[in-house]
């Protein structure tokens, strides 16, 4: 995939101490919406890497045909190839389900490269490692893609998470984990926890490792330390977030902070990248070149195009800054930082030089439809998707990848004065044009 | 405008360190929008990468010529300077240092080369 | 490792004629593609950098083109001085460690 872009469509100092595990103050929180402790059953559900998406195992018709599942928070869709497709193993054939049922309606998705198109109907779906419950649910039967699957990537689907306001072709088709909810006693509510090997993996390694779990209907401790902190869902359609502040090894980048969250911020499984409206992108890049001048790179690996290579187990993690995102608190006037290490902002590319060398892509790239918090934010942190609370909560991932010096961090609270400033209000009129140019 | 320049002995004996200096002229080896490189050629054969070398002295090397190349830069002086040790008869080449731009990636610019022979 | 492959090995045109020179890789370099010139005792000169943006003063019968995996360096109409060897050089993976095997333009 190339850097940063919407995944299926083609491929945007100072922590804690290693191993501190602060208290849970979370922990007393009420029990529900979302059951807490252990789902043995759901832990290492995930398979993949940032590169090309993290697929869970679902289940469609009957009887059940297996499909590996794009996990993607930043669409709204349940969508499956329903016909041969080169880079597709498998597919589902509506034919062969006793249970499917059409809809007898199109649905065509275009993208700012790329699209595809299928038709709408409904039948039963289960996660085999997820709850023990089936659902009937929206499906769209992909016939027809351009740029949508990726050669290699081991998925035939996507499953979109997020609000039935971003669905397509319109709102009215609910989601499937609104179906899920309505239809099961599920609590409504999933977590994340996308492990990034920290190295490139071969299709072979992909498919024999674990890249994660989703937790359906809970918050599970063993996936992570620390305490959980949570932000505020602005708007029910992408998971939407506010950012106040940002920091490059602690130096304020210091824009007003409406730049950051220009058109909106977004938290996105789907997307490679952190990816940054472009002022910002241009300021944390002149921000990490000065951090690492010690060193120069060239002008396209900034651009998240030329790779740099070095000797095996040689890779200068020191001399690459640490990035801070201050998020938007549940308090009046508190935030929390999440603060990620280049260990997820330099991702490992897949043996392109010798077997003696490490070779990374920038993965932080440009964007102009605002921020996206994609898989190389979401690596280091475990992600709770609290929907029932309309929150968002974060916590340091069991699994992320860090150095002996430094690792990601959750920390807070910070007094921060009119967050609420930070939020940038989209035109109604521009509404229609951005929902099609998912860039 | 800038000019490159290598110097050295034209005659080293096996096991020995080959040592040589490119001089630039016309411009400073400290701007920050170069490194410097050596690149060699074995007579009649094609381009080997040896290494380059940013102002601040931070090097990269060929894997496969790392465990014997040093690269040094003196500023002061406007030079950097090449040292491979251990040479044997393989490593007879056309020795040239360059310029790396155009975002760091392409020699764009060169000196004339410098024959080093490696024979007793 | 990225390989990359130059053919033919050697080319025999006649001054006016057009050479196209051929340079692939095992996988893709994006457009992070070079070609230099070398003459006979003299270094080699930068000609197309990113595939196909001519260096500074490099005349315009000389291009290059192509993405991915294949590129070419195409010399329009061949003046006396540009036969020579031509090198293609990837820096898709950096440090810009890669040339291709050369070309070599020959007199008919």
């Known amino acids: 995939t190339q850097h940063g872009i919407r995944l299926p469509l083609r491929s945007g100092l100072g922590g804690a101490p290693l191993g501190l595990r602060l208290p849970r103050e979370t922990d007393e929180e009420p029990e529900e919406p979302g059951r807490r402790g252990s789902f043995v059953e759901m832990v290492d559900n995930l398979r993949g890497k940032s590169g090309q998406g993290y697929y869970v195992e679902m289940t469609v018709g009957s009887p059940p045909q297996t499909l590996n599942i794009l996990v993607d928070t930043g669409s709204s869709n349940f969508a499956v190839g329903a016909a041969p497709h080169p880079f597709l193993h498998r597919y589902y054939q509506r034919q062969l389900s006793s249970t499917y049922r059409d809809l007898r309606k199109g649905v065509y998705v275009p993208y700012t490269q790329g699209k595809w198109e299928g038709e709408l109907g409904t039948d039963l779906v289960s996660i085999p490692h997820g709850p023990n419950v089936t659902v009937r649910a929206n499906i769209a039967a992909i016939t027809e893609s351009d740029k949508f699957f990726i050669n290699g990537s081991n998925w035939e689907g996507i499953l979109g998470l997020a609000y039935a306001e971003i669905a397509r072709p319109d709102d009215s088709l609910e989601p499937f984990f609104d179906s899920l909810v309505k239809q099961t006693h599920v609590p409504n509510l999933f977590s994340l926890q996308l492990c990034g090997a920290g190295f490139p993996l071969n299709q072979s390694e992909v498919l024999a490792s674990v890249g994660g779990s989703m937790i359906i209907g809970g918050i599970d401790h063993s996936l992570y330390t620390g305490s959980l902190w949570y932000t505020p869902i602005r708007r029910e359609w992408y998971y939407e977030v506010i950012i106040v502040r940002v920091e490059i090894n602690g130096q304020d980048l210091k824009m007003d902070c409406k730049e950051y969250n220009y058109d909106k911020s977004i938290v996105d499984s789907g997307t490679t990248n952190l990816r940054l409206p472009k002022k910002v992108f241009e300021a944390a890049v002149k921000s990490i070149k000065a951090a690492s001048s010690t060193e120069k790179f060239p002008d396209g690996f900034w651009l998240g195009e030329q790779l740099v290579c070095w000797q095996a187990g040689t890779t200068p993690w020191n001399i690459f800054p640490v990035i801070s995102l201050y998020l938007m608190g549940e308090v009046t006037n508190q935030s929390f930082r999440i603060t990620i290490l280049p260990q997820q902002y330099l991702r490992p590319v897949e043996d392109v030089a010798t077997s003696q060398d490490d070779c990374y892509k920038f993965a932080i790239s440009q964007s102009s439809t605002g921020t996206v918090m994609g898989a190389v934010i979401m690596e280091g942190f475990y992600v709770v998707f609290d929907r029932a609370r309309k929150r968002i909560g974060f916590a340091v991932s069991a699994c992320h990848v860090h150095d002996e010096f430094r690792t990601a961090a959750v920390e807070g609270p910070f007094v921060t004065l009119d967050m609420e400033d930070c939020g940038y209000n989209i035109p109604q009129t521009d509404e229609s044009t951005l929902m099609t140019g998912r860039a | 405008q800038l000019q490159l320049q290598e110097s050295g002995p034209g005659l080293v004996k096996p096991s020995e360190t080959l040592s040589l200096t490119c001089t630039v002229s016309?411009?400073?080896?400290?701007?920050?929008?170069?490194?410097w490189g050596w690149i060699r050629q074995p007579p009649g054969k094609g381009l080997e990468w040896i290494g380059m070398?940013?102002?601040?002295?931070?090097?990269w090397y060929n894997p496969s010529l790392r465990s014997r190349v040093t690269i040094s830069v003196d500023t002061s002086k406007n030079q950097f300077s090449l040292k491979l040790s251990s040479v044997t008869a393989a490593d007879t080449a056309v020795y040239y240092c360059a310029r790396v731009g155009h975002g760091v990636s392409y020699f764009d610019l060169w000196g004339r080369g410098t024959l080093v022979t490696v024979s007793s | 490792e990225i390989v990359l492959t130059q053919s033919p090995a050697t080319l025999s045109l006649s001054p006016g004629e057009r050479a196209t020179l051929s340079c692939r890789a095992s996988?893709?370099?994006?457009?992070?593609l070079a070609w230099y010139q070398q003459k006979p005792g003299q270094a080699p000169r930068l000609l197309i950098y990113?595939?196909?943006k001519r260096a500074t003063g490099i005349p315009a019968r000389f291009s290059g083109s192509g993405s991915g995996t294949d590129f070419t360096l195409t010399i329009s109409s061949l003046e006396p001085e540009d036969f020579a060897v031509y090198y293609c050089q990837q820096v898709y993976t950096w440090p810009p460690r890669t040339f291709g095997g050369g070309t070599k333009v020959e007199i008919k």
């Open positions: 996988q893709s370099v994006s457009s992070y």
């Open positions: 070398i940013y102002y601040s002295g931070s090097t």
């Open positions: 016309g411009g400073s080896i400290s701007s920050s929008s170069y490194y």
């Open positions: 990113d595939a196909s």
